[in-house]
Interface confidence: low
């Protein structure tokens, strides 16, 4: 439905408040360095301009699109040549091409300062003093530093953020209240983060048949009971969300998810019996339950695929008419019968299906071509299968610090090329799988394992994409979506790198270590640790071991030392003679 | 049976305009995102634009930027396909699919779309 404003149309269904928040995440998710003021202003600024609108849409400019409008007025900023360079070049361009611009400048990794957390007092009172200027600078803070979060999502976040400081401001023991609530914000922030950038990913970067086919048989496990068209429909309606927010049209995909997240809850009979207490909730908390919800219960007595997708004399017809409505229908059925497989394996079984089917339709005797198509599956089943047995083992073997650890020697062997920081993000959070995966059950362990492991790899692939620097890390990221895990998996030891030269500076240390958190204690030896591999990549896991064991010790001794700054200068000169003797640096 | 008749092309001269149409039957049409490909000779298929079920998105080759616009007749089971300012790297076959293969999706021969002076 045409509407005459868009921008009074979007201020009218989703309100005042929700609609000056999704500006502020627009605005601070594109110009990631810009203070927190300026983003104040301008959205003010555009929020005054909606409301005239809303009162007449045939004002001046009030029939000019969102991009027009948003991006006129981000190209108002006076210093933006200073701070973003060549993004200024992109005020130069007509729409669309200045928003495609802006996009593409979007930096995963913006160089800002990490967010130190005050004293809880000091939170409280400036939650109390303004509490609007409190969350705006929580939505502008995360939104800067992740310009890929989920902006309805972020909405939902905000609120319990609101909800955390309202309740513990006033408890008896306000940090014993509050503290694990923003850690536990901060940890399933950085997962939404995370999840959302590879939904963005794999359609700006393998395109909306690539997300439409994720999208089929991640909601065919969740809802088995519903119709192929009705799964179809929910699929088109979720492209339509995540390809709005991922362009940066955010007030659009916010009112769409809503739409969405209506309709789901006004046809969940022909949906899902999960879905009745998400759809007693409020909008954010309904959404955000939705997308969560747990797989709805298999229909009985389902037929054999095999009977329509192979014994079928019509397989060929069927394919050639609409194929993929047919691939569609193929992902469907069998993803409806196996929630015990992740989601990049039901692709690649539908993958090789495919590949089967344009082998053999064009042979002389089709059927007789794929009638063995379902005897290939098996060994695509068993890779993962037997890979996260292995690795839940070895977790059980280490705990979750030490299994970090030998995924950073592992990937730092396949990938030495890799910045240290992204190697120690990248593996510690392969190494959460551990913790997040393997307690489950066999039935739910691989769509935990394996789709958790295609979320991390894709910060690598994003973090490298930014500067591309390992021909392996751009082969694996780019040739196909759903073989990343198993292209990263098959990578041995570079044996093209040439090892770093040594500099005892990496691995001096000081008493400021001493003060750290356990966390970033951890991180700190990581750091070291893959300097050491890529010092001497040949190194055995024994000989990483004896060392590691050596530098723990040394640390523990000097921050229980008297002059804890002497002890690291001597005893840190000894440790870095030991470990060139031990590794023959 | 599913059905996508495409016509519409023909010989066109540099600069010059063509309107090409994909009528569809036999399966939901809007229910389905549509996409127009095209083959040049000896050359591999390019989707040249995509347009989603209800006509809000679409997406465009670099290519053609600007110059094609996809649209949609639910009603009517339709798909178009308006070419201006066409060039002589334009040449080639146009059929139109569901979804967003680039292998036809029917039994359709596409349309011959000639850019020549």
């Known amino acids: 439905d045409a509407h005459k404003s868009e921008v009074a149309h979007r201020f009218k269904d989703l309100g005042e408040e929700n609609f000056k928040a999704l500006v502020l995440i627009a605005f601070a998710q594109y110009l990631q360095q810009c203070p927190f003021e300026d983003h104040v202003k301008l959205v003010n600024e555009v929020t005054e301009f909606a409301k005239t609108c809303v009162a007449d849409e045939s004002a001046e400019n009030c029939d000019k699109s969102l991009h027009t409008l948003f991006g006129d007025k981000l190209c108002t900023v006076a210093t933006l040549r200073e701070t973003y360079g060549e993004m200024a070049d992109c005020c130069a361009k007509q729409e669309p091409e200045r928003n495609e611009c802006f996009l593409q400048h979007k930096d995963d990794n913006p160089n800002l300062p990490r967010l130190v957390r005050p004293e809880v007092d000091v939170m409280c009172t400036a939650f109390h003093d303004n509490e609007e200027t409190f969350l705006k600078k929580y939505l502008y803070e995360i939104a800067r530093r992740h310009p890929y979060f989920y902006a309805p999502e972020l909405l939902f976040f905000a609120k319990r953020y609101k909800a955390a400081f309202t309740e513990c401001c006033q408890a008896a023991d306000k940090a014993a209240c509050l503290l694990p609530k923003l850690d536990e914000l901060r940890d399933e922030g950085k997962a939404s983060s995370a999840k959302q950038r590879l939904k963005c990913a794999s359609l700006q970067k393998f395109g909306e048949r690539a997300f439409k086919a994720w999208a089929v048989a991640r909601l065919s496990q969740r809802f088995p009971k519903a119709e192929f068209a009705e799964v179809s429909k929910l699929v088109t309606d979720l492209t339509k969300v995540h390809t709005e927010c991922c362009h940066g049209d955010l007030l659009e995909c916010a009112d769409d998810r809503a739409d969405l997240a209506k309709y789901i809850c006004e046809n969940q009979d022909s949906i899902s019996s999960k879905l009745k207490e998400c759809c007693e909730k409020p909008l954010l908390e309904k959404s955000h339950c939705i997308a969560e919800v747990e797989n709805d219960e298999m229909p009985a007595d389902l037929p054999s695929l095999a009977a329509d997708f192979v014994e079928s004399k019509d397989v060929c017809k069927n394919y050639a008419e609409a194929k993929d409505v047919f691939l569609g229908m193929f992902l469907y059925e069998y993803a409806r019968r196996h929630p015990d497989y992740s989601v990049v394996l039901l692709l690649r079984l539908a993958k090789t299906y495919e590949t089967t089917l344009e082998k053999c339709c064009a042979a002389a005797d089709p059927h007789e071509c794929y009638a063995k198509v379902f005897d290939e599956f098996k060994p695509l089943v068993e890779e993962p299968q037997n890979l996260i047995k292995q690795n839940c083992e070895l977790f059980e073997q280490l705990g979750e610090y030490k299994f970090q650890n030998a995924l950073l020697v592992r990937y730092t062997k396949k990938v030495p090329q890799v910045s240290t920081p992204t190697l120690v993000e990248v593996s510690r959070n392969l190494g959460k799988v551990g913790s997040k995966c393997c307690k489950h059950p066999e039935a739910k362990r691989m769509p935990c394992a394996e789709d958790y492991l295609s979320v991390v790899l894709n910060q690598l692939c994003v973090l490298h994409e930014k500067t591309p620097v390992s021909d392996r890390v751009t082969k694996c990221c780019t040739e196909s979506l759903v073989n990343r895990r198993p292209c990263f998996s098959a990578l041995e030891v570079d044996e093209t790198y040439v090892p770093k030269e040594f500099n005892a500076e990496t691995f001096t240390f000081h008493a400021d270590i001493c003060t750290l958190s356990e966390k970033e204690r951890q991180i700190k030896k990581q750091t070291a640790l893959v300097e050491l591999v890529k010092h001497k990549p040949k190194a055995t896991k024994e000989q990483l071991k004896a060392v590691m064991d050596d530098f723990a010790a040394f640390v523990e001794k000097c921050c229980k030392a008297d002059d804890k700054e002497t002890c690291f200068a001597e005893e840190g000169k000894k440790l870095v003679a030991a470990s060139q003797a031990a590794l023959g640096l | 049976q599913v059905q996508l008749v495409e016509s519409g092309g023909g010989l066109v001269q540099p600069g010059g305009s063509l309107r090409l149409s994909c009528a569809a039957s036999?399966?939901?049409?809007?229910?389905?995102?549509m996409s127009w490909v095209r083959q040049a000779p000896a050359k591999g298929p390019e989707r040249v634009s995509a347009?989603?079920?209800?006509?809000?998105?679409?997406i465009y080759a670099d290519s053609v930027k600007g110059r094609f616009t996809i649209s949609r007749d639910n009603a009517k089971n339709t798909l178009y396909l308006q070419m201006n300012s066409l060039k002589p790297e334009d040449t080639a076959v146009y059929y139109c699919?569901?979804?967003?293969?680039?292998?036809?999706?029917?039994p359709g021969q596409g349309t011959q779309v000639t850019v020549s002076s």
């Open positions: 699919t569901i979804g967003s293969s680039t292998t036809p999706s029917g």
């Open positions: 036999g399966f939901t049409f809007g229910q389905f995102g």
């Open positions: 347009i989603s079920s209800d006509g809000s998105g679409t």
